[in-house]
């Protein structure tokens, strides 16, 4: 499973993080590192 199951009490959303510190700055300048719906937001 790539995400939490609905039946486990977790509501599934689609969120992608810049997880590795070394990737910060190479992802469109995102410093917060939250990508929602394909758009990096701060």
């Amino acid at each position: 499973d790539a995400e939490f199951r609905h039946d486990s009490g977790y509501e599934v959303h689609h969120q992608k993080l810049v997880f590795f510190a070394e990737d910060v700055g190479s992802n469109k300048g995102a410093i917060i590192g939250l990508m929602v719906g394909g758009v990096v937001i701060a």
Partner: antibody
């Protein structure tokens, strides 16, 4: 929906080779570093290879250096792990991971 | 490599109790941008690890607010305010500030 789906695991004899693949979807694959992490029978997690977003930089621990090669095809949204000179201690569940998401895992058993 | 040390190894709890897991790193996890890349996963039997908390205290999408993370520098804690049956499994801390990505040895949360 972010998905990482591994394939290619199996039973291999010591000294043999195997290539794992990981098909990614639901995110801009080419923007993210990716890794292969293995979970040994004692349940410990160990990074075995990582690669940056454009494939220009890789990392391997000493335990697999010279035997494992990580690569990626950003046009195909696919991550690979070529393993050779396999040893019994490489027996593990191998996960493709972006850190926040992990695949379901692919089992490698090295045994004669 | 950064060594991640988790305690306890096993944590027996009663449902409804609070649980607390400690994670210490062998060096500071503060990155040059001021962020601290310390994360917590839960792995249930037969599943891959799932991200719960990222960057010390941010809950990943869909994670209940009974999970909370705290700490700084080299000393971190995961708290579960009221343990439910679905929370049982093995918890891992992890750092991605430094290369290579490293993991704690795991803490098994089980019923007392």
């Amino acid at each position: 929906e972010v998905q990482l789906v591994e394939s290619g695991g199996g039973l291999v004899q010591p000294g043999g080779s195997l290539k794992l693949s990981c098909a990614a979807s639901g995110f801009t694959f080419s923007s993210y570093g990716m890794s292969w992490v293995r979970q040994t029978p004692d349940k410990r997690l160990e990074l075995v290879a990582s690669i940056n977003s454009n494939g220009g930089s890789t990392y391997y621990p000493d335990s697999v250096k010279g035997r494992f090669t990580i690569s990626r095809d950003n046009a195909k949204n696919t991550l690979y792990l070529q393993m050779s000179s396999l040893k019994s201690e490489d027996t593990a569940m191998y996960y493709c991971a972006s850190g926040d998401y992990w695949g379901q895992g692919s089992t490698l058993t090295v045994s004669s | 490599d950064v060594v991640m040390t988790q305690t306890p190894l096993s944590l027996p709890v009663s449902l409804g109790d609070q649980a607390s897991i400690s994670c210490r790193s062998s060096q500071s996890l503060v990155y040059s941008n001021g962020d601290t890349y310390l994360h917590w996963y839960l792995q249930k039997p037969g599943q891959s690890p799932k991200l719960l908390i990222y960057k010390v205290s941010s809950r990943f999408s869909g994670v209940p607010d009974r999970f909370s993370g705290s700490g700084s520098g080299t000393d971190f804690t995961l708290k579960i305010s009221r343990v439910e049956a679905e929370d049982l499994g093995v918890y891992f801390c992890s750092q991605s500030t430094h290369v290579p990505w490293t993991f704690g040895g795991g803490t098994k949360l089980e019923i007392k």
